[in-house]
Interface confidence: low
């Protein structure tokens, strides 16, 4: 089934990485996964 994924893109907020985890908010911490062109690259 198609579960949630993290979209590509991030920004620095309070000197912490904020991922563009669309729909479920953001995670300030570690890299969970980057999507580029539909492919997980990290």
């Amino acid at each position: 089934d198609a579960e949630f994924r993290h979209d590509s893109g991030y920004e620095v907020h309070h000197q912490k990485l904020v991922f563009f985890a669309e729909d479920v908010g953001s995670n300030k911490g570690a890299i969970i996964g980057l999507m580029v062109g539909g492919v997980v690259i990290a």
């Epitope: 949630f4 912490k16 479920v24 908010g25 300030k28």
Partner: antibody, heavy 125, light 106 residues
């Protein structure tokens, strides 16, 4: 007034099925991430399932994966939770909740700002 | 799986300050929200994004989050603040709730 109203709970035997509904008022569920959260009697809150604005995006807690299915009907502005193969440990009050999104900055976690009144599911023989 | 730990109960006298902790591995790296739940009622969001108050939540509610501990502080606690309080954080793309803390106003 922005609100959520759950229905569909009740008494069911182990192995049985139920479908919970959550009707939204004054906002469009299709534009929000929606959650199901449950609370067993006398216990804490437990995340159950989530569906995103893109309804192909969803996720389930390990405890319900393969048994529960989240969905929504945008025309009825209603969220659903289909629960199959129910177990005694699924007995709980089930809440639907809206993820608060600032649509000008839609990638931030704000928490669940609107909750329904809850519907009780009792699994017992 | 990620776990958030809260004290089961906290007691405070009216007018005093109550602090409720929420511990988790590197919780400071994730956003935290706090919910208040009174008996027979649905949860209410009282803090979001670590330390922000939604409109309608009294100023006596404040919070912080760094390292391995998030803290909810209620200054000048009132009888109406007696409730269960739950912290919540993000574990990848799911939500995790703490076990809850029962705040008793003596």
């Amino acid at each position: 007034e922005v609100q959520l109203l759950e229905s569909g709970g009740g008494l069911v035997q182990p192995g049985g099925s139920l479908r919970l509904s959550c009707a939204a008022s004054s906002f469009q569920i299709s534009k929000n991430t929606m959650w199901w959260v449950r609370q067993a009697p006398g216990k804490g809150l437990e995340w159950v399932s989530v569906i995103g604005k893109d309804e192909t995006r969803f996720n389930y807690a390990d405890s319900v994966k393969g048994r529960f299915t989240i969905s929504r009907d945008n025309s009825k502005n209603t969220l659903y939770l289909q629960m199959n193969s129910l177990r005694a440990e699924d007995t709980a009050v089930y809440y639907c909740a809206r993820e608060w999104m600032d649509h000008s900055r839609p990638y931030y976690y704000y928490g669940m700002d609107v909750w329904g009144q809850g519907t009780l599911v009792t699994v017992s023989s | 799986s990620y776990e958030l730990t809260q004290p089961p109960s906290v007691s405070v006298s009216p007018g005093q300050t109550a602090s409720i902790t929420c511990s988790g591995r590197n919780i400071g790296d994730s956003w935290v929200a706090w919910y208040q739940q009174k008996p027979g009622q649905s949860p209410v969001l009282v803090i979001y994004r670590d330390d922000k108050r939604p409109s309608g939540i009294p100023e006596r509610f404040s919070a912080s989050n760094s390292g391995h501990t998030a803290t909810l502080t209620i200054s000048g606690t009132q009888a109406m603040d007696e409730a269960d309080y739950y912290c919540s954080s993000q574990d990848t793309v799911t939500r995790v709730f703490g076990g809850g803390t029962k705040l008793t106003v003596l």
